[in-house]
């Protein structure tokens, strides 16, 4: 094959060399760039600054190698567009520092930058971290901070990423109260901060307010919804980023629904009960309480992270006869008492049957259901203890 | 496989007590009642009451009640009994069995209590 | 409380049909105090053989099986071997608490 005189040179089928003396000072128009896995760039000493858009197109690239070059500063944010790199080649250039953004979001298997001028500081302290865990095969490399010594070596007893602290209200909170969070940012060289509120959706109106160090958040007019969702106060300084998420609880009434029974391994009254603070919950049958035994019993579902409602089962292990009747569960809490009932039918009385009958075996339990979501105050009936006496 | 291992063999003086412990290995421990039985020569089996891990919730023989307490770690999978105020009539061998009902289900090998003076 | 009342012992040969029983002191048992069948060999080894009334673990040998004959719970081996030698115990399940009948010895001989 013909030698190539182009700046890049294709090599194999999905990479590029380019080694010709001072041909770049920018990586824009890279020829088949978006087929590119293989990246390697020797020589350039013009090519100074990495930056997101130098790097745009270059999806599948899997290796980048800039190496005896001038390069001098690489963007935070320079390789949003390559996801898949694994091996980042930035030996003997200018380097004097690199942003822990500039790798969050890779999987490096990688990451060498011996031999460029690094100035020892707090924002290499990322870099000093993976040395001492053994990543990126950075050990190895043994790096030296331009007249300063080994990184190894750096004082980092002052490198700390930002502390928050977020004031959430003591006080009981109510559907369609306001709600102020505050959170204090404490630490050196802070950059940026603010609020992540992706799982609010439709639980509040919000407004945002101050800045650093204190930031503001209000939540107006909220819901029972945003009960269990997270609020994040976030931010981040040369070391790194800092979150803190809290929650805030919203109070409202219980509420219960019960369906009816459905024989599984065993039989199975299904409920759902919802209530902040999580309410009591007291079944009576026949309208006298029901203590519950290893033959009838509740079992809740495991619960979703998110949300306050519960679901689960008077479970009843092969009930008989006995066991027909209404069941009647009641859910209470500070704010309000809620009750469902239903009917269920398990098995016929084998001693109540006329001989010129066939004899029963047993039947679906009847669908009657009827429930009360309302809640109705009543402060006079406490939640039942968990220890019963027999005998 | 489900297997309830008991702790040793206790020799207690009169008006102590003793905590015997039922590690469980094999299934889901916070969803299966645990069964407390006592025996003794001459006197049979007896049920001292019943626990439900996950929950917490206990029901006594009234003729065991504040004589044993029922408590379960389900950090570990271990449910215990404490048996207080030790007279001879507590000398018996204390078994703890995973009930799943209407099966009374796996029984550990038995704790043996000695009160003695 | 409710006393559980067991023959105390039986005798049988191998290969043979023999029958346990077990009474309640309040009357009938019925589906409703789910009879247990416990078997009990020496150095404290208990098995569970039959639950709510007629069921049985998996693991048991077909040879037990649990019925109610009148007013009494029942556990029948039918085709005794000689390793059914043991202590028998009936339980009973009365709305809120077990309890236990006597025990009936059974020698297989």
């Known amino acids: 094959a013909a030698p190539c005189p182009d700046a890049c040179c294709p090599h194999g089928s999905s990479g590029l060399r380019c080694t010709r003396d001072g041909a770049l000072d920018s990586l824009h128009h890279l020829p088949g760039a978006e087929n590119l896995t293989e990246l390697y760039i020797e020589n350039q000493q013009h090519l100074q600054h990495l930056e997101l858009r130098d790097l745009r197109g270059l999806g599948e690239l899997r290796n980048l190698t800039i190496v005896k070059s001038g390069l001098r500063f690489v963007a935070p944010d320079a390789f949003h567009f390559t996801p898949r790199l694994s091996r980042l080649n930035l030996s003997f250039n200018a380097l004097e520092s690199l942003s822990w953004k500039t790798v969050q979001g890779l999987s490096l298997q990688e990451l060498v930058l011996s031999g460029n001028p690094l100035h020892c500081s707090c924002a290499l302290r990322w870099l000093q971290r993976w040395e001492e865990e053994g990543l990126g095969g950075v050990p190895e490399q043994k790096l030296q901070c331009h007249g300063q010594g080994p990184l190894a070596h750096m004082p980092n007893a002052s490198c700390g990423v930002p502390t928050l602290k977020v004031q959430v209200p003591n006080a009981s909170v109510d559907v369609g109260d306001d709600v102020l969070l505050r959170c204090q940012v404490e630490g050196r060289g802070l950059e940026q901060a603010g609020w992540i509120l992706t799982e609010l959706e439709q639980s509040a109106t919000v407004m945002k307010s101050g800045g650093l160090p204190s930031l503001g958040l209000t939540l107006a007019n909220v819901t029972s919804d945003l009960n269990r969702k997270n609020v994040t106060c976030w931010a981040e300084n040369d070391v790194g980023r800092a979150e803190v998420s809290v929650q805030v609880n919203v109070s409202f009434p219980a509420s219960v629904q019960l369906h009816t029974a459905v024989e599984m391994h065993h039989w199975c009254i299904p409920f759902s009960v919802d209530g902040q603070p999580a309410p009591s919950l007291r079944w009576l049958f026949n309208g006298s309480v029901l203590n519950e035994t290893s033959f009838i019993f509740t079992e809740f579902l495991e619960p979703a992270a998110n949300e306050t409602v519960r679901h689960g089962c008077l479970r009843l292990n092969q009930p008989t006869h006995v066991n027909n009747g209404n069941y009647t569960l009641l859910a209470a809490n500070p704010f309000g008492q809620a009750s469902a009932s239903i009917m269920a039918a398990f098995m016929d009385n084998p001693f109540e049957f006329n001989p010129e009958d066939p004899i029963p075996v047993s039947f679906s339990p009847v669908d009657t259901n009827s429930t009360s979501g309302d809640p109705v105050e009543k402060k006079d009936e406490t939640p039942f203890g968990v220890s019963v006496a027999v005998g | 496989q489900v297997q309830l291992q008991q702790s040793g063999a206790e020799l207690m003086k009169p008006g102590a007590s003793v905590k015997i412990s039922c590690k469980t290995t094999g299934y889901r421990f916070s969803s299966y009642w645990i069964e407390w039985v006592k025996q003794r020569p001459g006197h049979g089996l007896e049920w001292l009451g019943e626990?439900?891990?996950?929950?917490?919730?206990?029901n006594y023989n009234e003729n065991f009640r504040g004589k044993a307490t029922f408590t379960a770690d389900t950090s570990s999978n271990t449910a215990y009994v404490q048996l207080s105020s030790l007279t001879s009539e507590d000398s018996a061998v204390y078994f703890c069995a995973r009930t799943d009902p209407p099966y009374f289900g796996v029984w550990g090998a038995g704790t043996t209590v000695t009160v003695s003076s | 409380q409710a006393v559980v009342t067991q023959e105390s012992a039986l005798t049988t040969s191998p290969g043979e049909t023999v029958t346990l029983t077990c009474r309640s002191s309040?009357?009938?048992?019925?589906?409703?105090?789910?009879a247990n069948w416990v078997q009990e060999k020496p150095d404290h080894l208990f098995t569970g053989l039959i639950g709510?009334?007629?069921n049985r673990p998996p693991g048991v040998p077909a040879r037990f099986s649990g019925s109610l004959i009148g007013d009494k719970a029942a556990l029948t081996i039918t085709g005794a071997q000689t390793e059914d030698e043991a202590i028998y115990f009936c339980v009973l399940w009365y709305s809120n608490h077990w309890v236990f009948g006597g025990g009936t010895k059974l020698t297989v001989l």
């Open positions: 309040t009357g009938a048992v019925t589906i409703s105090n789910y």
């Open positions: 626990i439900l891990p996950g929950r917490g919730i206990i």
């Open positions: 709510g009334t007629n």
